[in-house]
Interface confidence: medium
């Protein structure tokens, strides 16, 4: 059986101030179990966007309904972009784990730019 | 009902290191982004730094930077701010702040802790 | 850096008059801006936040306006437990998150 593949498609996304960005992110397989979770950047400073299975994150929306059986989309939308959200957004999933989920795989990353509103 | 609840501050001589605590409850402190700010006395609200959900993404006042280490444990409930190297600038009331979202507003503000640093 | 001014430093308003609190950036940060209350010796305290929204238990009295680089916070009616530092604080751009200077409430 193939191993799980995590896929960006968008290596770069353009958004102008105040609208939405979607960020695409595809799995391959639905093992291993586990949740995924959205960060900006990379490494130790990452900063957690979403977290599948717990948090507070009133700006993300998810694509589609991700607790749906089968499902491999979990491509989330931000709302009311602002220059601060600039940065590289990882798609990162995690095995299920006792006591904490261990990572994975990441996808390669997607890079979103912040355009200034237009006048 | 929120509540954030700050301990450690004292007065200590220039040079040495002093360590702050927030104890929160009334929320899911893990699913929320931290901060400290600072007020000098007579003066106005100052930044200090901030800490995501996750703990791994961290930011810092210029001010502070290379000085201060924000970190939290989110089995205890409660954020830390690391002083060291303490400068008689650095003498404020620290205060804690919940952040609404990962980029967003300070919705709730903890009573403060008075941190002296004077020969 | 974005910065904000707040003005006037201070405004002393009779009870049951309109107080009127202006911040302007020096750039734009579109509809993130927070308007924070600290009475004092206490902590401070948010009242509105994406420039015109009141935080939970605010009273009507309090309302904020504006967007990009010029904003209001107005309090209709002033009461006597009004009197505070108010400061206004944005989240457009960060870090560092920046507040205002503050503008001191007196009751005449």
């Known amino acids: 059986e193939d191993e799980l593949q995590v896929i960006q498609p968008e290596k770069s996304v353009s958004v102008a101030a105040g609208e939405s960005a979607t960020l695409r992110c595809a799995m391959t397989s639905l093992i291993p179990v586990g949740p995924i979770m959205w960060f900006r950047g990379a490494g130790a400073g990452r900063e957690l966007i979403y977290n599948q299975k717990e948090g507070h994150f009133p700006r993300v929306t998810t694509v589609s309904e991700l607790t749906k059986r089968n499902n491999l989309d979990f491509s989330i939308s931000i709302s009311n972009i602002t220059p601060a959200d600039a940065g590289t957004y990882y798609c990162v999933k995690f095995r299920k784990g006792s006591p904490d989920d261990v990572e994975f795989k990441s996808g390669a990353g997607t890079e979103l730019s912040v355009r200034a509103k237009p006048s | 009902d929120v509540q954030l609840v700050e301990s450690g501050g004292g007065v200590v001589r220039p040079g040495e290191s002093l360590r702050l605590s927030c104890a929160a409850s009334g929320f899911s402190f893990r699913s929320y982004a931290m901060n400290w700010v600072r007020q000098a006395p007579g003066e106005g609200l100052e930044w200090v730094s901030r800490i995501d959900s996750g703990g791994g993404g961290t930011d810092y006042a210029d001010s502070v930077k290379g000085r201060f280490t924000i970190s939290r444990d989110n089995s205890k409930n409660t954020l830390y701010l690391q002083m060291n190297s303490l400068r008689a600038e650095d003498t404020a009331v620290y205060y804690c702040?919940?952040?609404?979202?990962?980029?967003?507003?300070?919705?709730?503000w903890g009573l403060g802790a008075p941190v002296t640093v004077s020969s | 850096e974005t910065v904000l001014t707040q003005s006037p430093a201070t405004l002393s308003v009779s009870p049951g008059e309109r107080a009127t609190l202006s911040c302007r950036a020096s750039q734009t940060v579109g509809s993130k801006l927070a308007w924070h209350q600290q009475k004092p010796g206490q902590a401070p305290r948010l009242l509105i936040y994406?420039?015109?929204n009141r935080a939970t238990g605010i009273p009507d009295r309090f309302s904020g306006s504006g967007s990009g680089t010029d904003f209001t916070l107005t309090i209709s009616s002033l009461q006597t437990e009004d009197s505070a530092v108010y400061y206004c604080?944005?989240?457009?751009?960060?870090?560092?998150?920046?507040f205002g200077g503050g503008t001191k409430v007196e009751i005449k």
């Open positions: 702040a919940k952040q609404y979202d990962w980029n967003s507003f300070f919705d709730y």
């Open positions: 994406d420039a015109s």
């Open positions: 604080q944005q989240y457009y751009y960060w870090p560092p998150y920046r």
